[in-house]
């Protein structure tokens, strides 16, 4: 019993003056608490307690369940204890099967002994199975057996407390250990789609999947820069013991333009947090935006190919697309496809393939596209570059020499005189008159130019060259002159192509 110096309050004394007492089942337990300021006896076993306000605790016929710690407390709050074992050959263990372990922590298998003199107090696996090799335990006859540093692998482990009594191994009722995992990583979060585009009034629904080792993981949908509580629904599954999945679905039944923004799915556990975002854009109505991938004014050489390419954004998805030329719709030579296979894709590509274009195929090519809300179109002006062609070259009755050439871009006509038999016509002759004949006609196709010179200026035999040229090429026509007396005669004109 404890002793203290005079004047100070002292703990109560217990009779019998022992720290432990062994009583046979059926015998009497008689404990006396000696203290002028006696308050109560407390009996404690398996974390359950009973109280008694009498200073003498008497149990006439002791049972195994009377095994435990008896504490006497006085008015100063000072106490003394005695531990009583009620030896019962038929009930060696007091058992509380509540057995929960937290990963990496210790846990107590509550199977205190009723007889402290038995041997080999330990744990055994059920049905003779061995315990895990790394399972370490510490026995304490008054409390039970502590499993040290519980592992996740011990979850649902079936075990017994065991002790040898008079040479025989005795087992307690079975215990099933339930292990709660420790969080050793942040939750894994993913979202059904990274972005959503909706029209006003449509339903917005997005699902966040949270994966962790247990259902204790916390998760919520948040609107960035807002404290408003969002309505979410949950579904969850346990795929085995430490593989938990939750789906948190956020729904806005009728989205408005001001619902647009970034929504975050946030999850955390005791290890840390993780989040993933999705972007919602709500538009008041659908749209189509077309972006030409080449200049809308196109120049192409005669006989060459050209691809007219557009990219366009369409929401909702496009329903009709067509390419038109001269009020005629192309049935082939074009293709239309989504820019990506992503399900949130709103960008598309349309290509019209024009091959071996002729000079007569210049003009406006129009791409039209529509969806349920809007129509849109874009026009390409295609100009076919052609080298000049000399349509007519004549000597008119008034003595003028006239050359008419067609081509695109607009040809330039130059005149040259070659005296005598010289092959090179270098002396240029200024035209008297130059006209563009179809400048006010249709905007595409060849431009026709007429140029005239006065032949009376020529006094010698020779050749007159009319040369029409543009960026693409050049063509020439020739007039031969011979003087017979005072008469000037035009010999057969002929053309000579000069590349």
């Amino acid at each position: 019993q404890p002793s203290v110096s005079p004047g100070e309050p002292s703990p109560p004394s217990i009779h019998p003056a022992k720290s432990e007492l062994i009583v046979r089942v059926g015998n009497e337990i008689r404990l006396l608490c000696i203290d002028p300021g006696f308050v109560k006896w407390t009996f404690e076993i398996l974390d359950e307690t009973n109280e008694n306000k009498q200073n003498e605790w008497i149990t006439e016929k002791a049972e195994a369940t009377n095994t435990g710690k008896y504490t006497c407390t006085n008015k100063h709050g000072l106490s003394s204890s005695i531990y009583v074992f009620v030896r019962d050959p038929a009930k060696l263990f007091l058992v509380d099967r509540s057995l929960y372990g937290k990963e990496d922590n210790d846990t107590l298998v509550r199977c205190p002994l009723t007889d402290p003199e038995v041997t080999s107090y330990s744990l055994k696996g059920c049905q003779g199975k061995p315990l895990p090799k790394d399972l370490r335990f510490v026995p304490d006859p008054k409390a039970g057996i502590t499993i040290k540093s519980v592992k996740r692998a011990y979850h649902r482990l079936c075990l017994h407390c065991s002790a040898d009594q008079e040479g025989k191994s005795v087992l307690s009722d079975k215990f099933i250990l339930k292990v709660r995992p420790a969080f050793k990583a942040v939750p894994v979060v993913s979202v059904s789609k990274a972005s959503y585009l909706l029209r006003e009034g449509e339903e917005f629904t997005v699902t966040c999947t949270i994966k962790d080792v247990s259902s204790s993981v916390y998760s919520t949908w948040k609107r960035e820069n807002s404290q408003t509580k969002l309505q979410e629904k949950y579904n969850s599954w346990h795929h085995g013991d430490f593989n938990y999945e939750r789906q948190a679905t956020l729904t806005i039944s009728s989205a408005r333009v001001n619902d647009s923004g970034v929504f975050m799915c946030y999850a955390n556990n005791t290890f840390g947090s993780a989040n993933v975002t999705t972007t919602l854009e709500v538009v008041d109505k659908g749209f189509i935006n077309i972006f030409p991938m080449i200049n809308t004014t196109v120049f192409v050489n005669d006989g060459e190919n050209v691809d007219l390419i557009v990219e366009y954004e369409a929401f909702p998805k496009p329903e009709h697309q067509q390419w038109i030329y001269m009020n005629r719709t192309f049935t082939d030579k074009w293709e239309d496809y989504p820019k990506s296979e992503n399900e949130s894709n709103i960008r598309y590509v349309s290509e019209l393939h024009l091959t071996r274009l002729k000079g007569t195929e210049g003009g406006t090519y129009t791409f039209l596209v529509s969806n349920s809300d809007v129509n849109a179109s874009i026009a390409f002006n295609v100009y076919v570059n052609t080298k000049p062609e000399i349509l007519t070259y004549d000597r008119l009755v008034n003595g003028m020499l006239q050359c008419v050439a067609a081509g695109f871009p607009e040809p330039t006509i130059d005149w040259y005189f070659c005296p005598g038999t010289e092959q090179r016509c270098s002396a240029s002759v200024l035209p008297v008159d130059v006209q563009t004949l179809n400048a006010s006609g249709p905007p595409f196709g060849k431009l026709v130019v007429q140029s005239s010179i006065d032949s009376s200026a020529f006094k010698h035999n020779g050749t007159v060259e009319c040369k029409a040229y543009n960026d693409v090429g050049k063509t020439s026509a020739y007039f031969n002159f011979a003087f017979k007396g005072n008469n000037k005669e035009q010999i057969h004109p002929h053309t000579l192509f000069t590349p």
Epitope: D47, E48, T49, L99, K102, I176, K178, R180, S215, H238
Partner: antibody
Framework: QVQLKESGPGLVQPSQTLSLTCTVS????????VHWVRQPPGKTLEWVGL???????SYNSALKSRLSISRDTSKSQVFLKMHSLQAEDTATYYC??????????WGHGTLVTVSS | DIQMTQSPASLSASLEEIVTITCKAS??????LSWYQQKPGKSPQLLIY???RLADGVPSRFSGSRSGTQYSLKISRPQVADSGIYYC?????????FGAGTKLELK
């Protein structure tokens, strides 16, 4: 002997916060699990949440955003706090002790009415 | 979350019958299933834990069994005192979930 007793206000205004206390005796909160279970009048039992022996908590998925469970081991008390109460939260609220044998001990329950 | 589908919702039985109440779990819950009886105005009382084991003081006419994810509570030769509502509870993983209850009336 093991006992659990719920206490708290009988009447709570809509949108207000409910605070309940479960006072236990005869056992230690560090050794056992204490659950909250509720039962609307004439309806089924609904598991609300749990205070683990090591102080961790677990909650009903549908209620977790407005629920908080805590404890004071020195006073042997477990607390339930639920905010933004509505009429459908009207119920008898029970606390119960669990061992591996199931919910072996229950309190008598306390009726909470949500009404203005 | 794990759903517990309990049936029937109610039944009326005579004292000579064998009453069977079932609960089906939406996924595996091992043996972590218990049964409770509740009488009007009273707290629920534990009847059976670990699927088959009788709680202290529960008469042997009550028994529990399991087939896969289907769990059954049987009352053979029920007595008038057995009237009440019976619930199953899964404690395999949090959040724990109760069945919707079966109201037993005795003729």
């Amino acid at each position: 002997q093991v006992q659990l007793k719920e206490s708290g206000p009988g009447l709570v205004q809509p949108s207000q916060t409910l605070s309940l206390t479960c006072t236990v005796s005869g056992f230690s909160l560090t050794s056992y699990l204490v659950h909250w279970v509720r039962q609307p009048p004439g309806k089924t039992l609904e598991w609300v949440g749990l205070m683990w022996n090591d102080g961790d908590t677990s909650y009903n998925s549908a209620l977790k955003s407005r629920l908080s469970i805590s404890r004071d081991t020195s006073k042997s008390q477990v607390f339930l706090k639920m905010h933004s109460l509505q009429a459908e939260d009207t119920a008898t609220y029970y606390c119960a002790r669990e061992s591996n044998l199931g919910f072996t001990y229950w309190g008598h329950g306390t009726l909470v009415t949500v009404s203005s | 979350d794990i759903q517990m589908t309990q049936s029937p919702a109610s039944l009326s039985a005579s004292l000579e019958e064998i009453v069977t109440i079932t609960c089906k779990a939406s996924q595996g819950i091992d043996d972590d299933l218990s049964w409770y009886q509740q009488k009007p105005g009273k707290s629920p009382q534990l009847l059976i834990y670990d699927v088959t084991r009788l709680a202290d003081g529960v008469p042997s006419r009550f028994s529990g069994s399991r087939s896969g994810t289907q769990y059954s509570l049987k009352i053979s030769r029920p007595q008038v005192a057995d009237s009440g509502i019976y619930y199953c509870l899964q404690s395999y993983s949090t959040p724990y979930t109760f069945g919707a209850g079966t109201k037993l009336e005795l003729k």
